[in-house]
Amino acid sequence: DWVVAPISVPENGKGPFPQRLNQLKSNKDRDTKIFYSITGPGADSPPEGVFAVEKETGWLLLNKPLDREEIAKYELFGHAVSENGASVEDPMNISIIVTDQNDHKPKFTQDTFRGSVLEGVLPGTSVMQVTATDEDDAIYTYNGVVAYSIHSQEPKDPHDLMFTIHRSTGTISVISSGLDREKVPEYTLTIQATDMDGDGSTTTAVAVVEILDANDNAPMFDPQKYEAHVPENAVGHEVQRLTVTDLDAPNSPAWRATYLIMGGDDGDHFTITTHPESNQGILTTRKGLDFEAKNQHTLYVEVTNEAPFVLKLPTSTATIVVHVEDVNEAPVFVPPSKVVEVQEGIPTGEPVCVYTAEDPDKENQKISYRILRDPAGWLAMDPDSGQVTAVGTLDREDEQFVRNNIYEVMVLAMDNGSPPTTGTGTLLLTLIDVNDHGPVPEPRQITICNQSPVRQVLNITDKDLSPHTSPFQAQLTDDSDIYWTAEVNEEGDTVVLSLKKFLKQDTYDVHLSLSDHGNKEQLTVIRATVCDCHGHVETCPGPWKGG
């Protein structure tokens, strides 16, 4: 029959070439002379000339060695024609399968593989995967089947078999206990890939396993005991730097220290922060310390890490004895701001109050006093006793120096320490009103018509406070009552001035006496301009000119 079974040809054949493979034969050759030919890739199309056929015998020839990794199968067509060129058979399919030889070594996809695993993990934990390829066939033969193995491990601590590799997948896993980054931060494994499923050619690569840090080491104080000296009253003062060592990875959360004052800071006087570079604990004062109250503090500070410990670890504690140093403290006025009520206008030399300071220091220091700020110059202060006396007239109504009835004075106390220190106090004199001002009308100039005049309403003001103000009383004096009337309204805070007789156009003085509720009298002269006009007027009209 005009058929041929698939032909298997090993790659890398050594010849001699041409090499006979199989014979094409048509049974029509009994009737006529047959000529054979082949077509297809590998015959008459690229790669041309790999195969040929003996025209008259039909022997299929291989002209050169084959490479399975280049072309694994050739599909050709065989043809049979008579002498006159007429086809005597249908084209026949010829399959040539190139069988594999183990002519390639495995190749790792990288020269160096990198992986990582947390220190202290359990056996069985996967680390990384390595991959090698082999161009040879791994389906029908073992030529391309790669088996992985670990050839060596450096360093060999704590022993030489810390890792294992899955022979088929190349997955590297931990096989032993004892991965400790602080002892061995990195392992270098020489890995092998061997074809023939482990019985053939071998190639090597390197797998570098980084051991990642876990917080398995507690920070430890070094030293554990400290003594420090701090001046009293200093706030934000650096007391002491506490040093710790931690075997975990520097600048990682497992290394960075967190400090906590565990005891000895009853008054919440101290605070502790971590220095970002040195990792030291910086102990500072949050509040001023008081030598007189407590001259020594014993603090207990515990250190942990930013990251939680991965296992139960004992925490380190430091003891800091803080000695408070005495400083010459400023006298303190008691109270710092003193309110004193005093009548305005008291006689010169009259005592106002005694305002003294206390010295926090335990020594009996002498305190001297003086006035620091007395805007109106109304007061004096005895340097020894702190007695404040009036040396000027205290005027509640003095708007330049008195605000809301209060006159503010700053006083100073100085001790005789070396160097001397000073403290200030504020004396707030609440000035009690005295009826020292009479009522005053506003305005004091009016313009009025001499015919059908409009009543003039004047407001009454009094600088004093109630009850030294309204209701007011009005009285005209010096014959002003001949031409004018003055009446205080119901509320008692305005006076109505009326022209009761005709006056020719001119300017007149109206003598008005006003008295307040405390009978304090004030005489005021009102300048009245009388105009020749009817009713309401603001300014006198000029002389009328007829046409």
């Epitope: 359990l122 078999l161 294992t164 022979r167 096989i175 206990s177 876990a214």
Partner: antibody, heavy 117, light 111 residues
Framework: EVQLLESGGGLVQPGGSLRLSCAAS????????MSWVRQAPGKGLEWVSA????????YYADSVKGRFTISRDNSKNTLYLQMNSLRAEDTAVYYC??????????WGQGTMVTVSS | QSALTQPASVSGSPGQSITISCTGT?????????VSWYQQHPGKAPKLILS???KRPSGVSNRFSGSKSGNTASLSISGLQAEDEADYYC???????????FGGGTKLTVL
């Protein structure tokens, strides 16, 4: 000589708790991962839980996850297994074992845990 | 993870040799040379008799030997003795879980 000595087993009602201990001697305890393996009556060995030498890593079989807690105190050379919400199927002899190279190298004599009402 | 497969029982006469098989997969027995064998006498704790396929801990008789081919490991005991009667468990390091997978156990009877 390596010795592992379990204790803490006994009879407990379903839903109850027990704490097993395993005292180790004769080797550097903190260098070895440790495991608990159990054997139900007439049955084979079943791995239960493991803990790394430092105590930083722990693993559990799915059957006990969330109910059992493994821990160790390296200062006392002691391994623990806290067993909560116990079930009838947890009835077994519990062994502690030290991990060698790819194998449970040394075993304790076991402690019996019976969960029954 | 299913257990490694062992025959439920084997038997032999004193002086004979027996072999116990332990069949796993390409992810356990076939993948690693970390197969171990344990001997357990009734009422006693398991005892390691072979590790890393064929390594005997000190004190274990050289009548015990191990081998592995593909996904199957084997324990061989030569010159059977009455005290060899016990349960034998294989275990293998395996991918994806921590620690070892155990076989179901084989009861060895010395006739």
């Amino acid at each position: 000589e390596v010795q592992l000595l379990e204790s803490g087993g006994g009879l407990v009602q379903p839903g109850g708790s027990l704490r097993l201990s395993c005292a180790a001697s004769g080797f550097t305890f903190s260098s070895y991962a440790m495991s608990w393996v159990r054997q139900a009556p007439g049955k084979g060995l079943e791995w239960v839980s493991a803990i790394s030498g430092s105590g930083g890593s722990t693993y559990y079989a799915d059957s006990v996850k969330g109910r059992f807690t493994i821990s160790r105190d390296n200062s006392k050379n002691t391994l623990y297994l806290q067993m909560n919400s116990l079930r009838a199927e947890d009835t077994a002899v519990y062994y502690c074992a030290s991990w060698g190279l790819g194998s449970n190298e040394n075993w304790g004599q076991g402690t019996m845990v019976t969960v029954s009402s | 993870q299913s257990a490694l497969t062992q025959p439920a029982s084997v038997s032999g006469s004193p002086g004979q040799s027996i072999t116990i098989s332990c069949t796993g997969t390409s992810n356990d027995v076939g993948a690693y040379n970390y197969v171990s064998w344990y001997q357990q006498h009734p009422g006693k704790a398991p005892k390691l008799i072979l590790s890393e396929v064929n390594k005997r801990p000190s004190g274990v008789s050289n009548r015990f030997s191990g081998s592995k081919s593909g996904n199957t490991a084997s324990l061989s005991i030569s010159g059977l003795q009455a005290e060899d009667e016990a349960d034998y468990y294989c275990s293998s390091f395996t991918s994806g879980i921590v620690f070892n997978l155990f076989g179901g156990g084989t009861k060895l009877t010395v006739l």
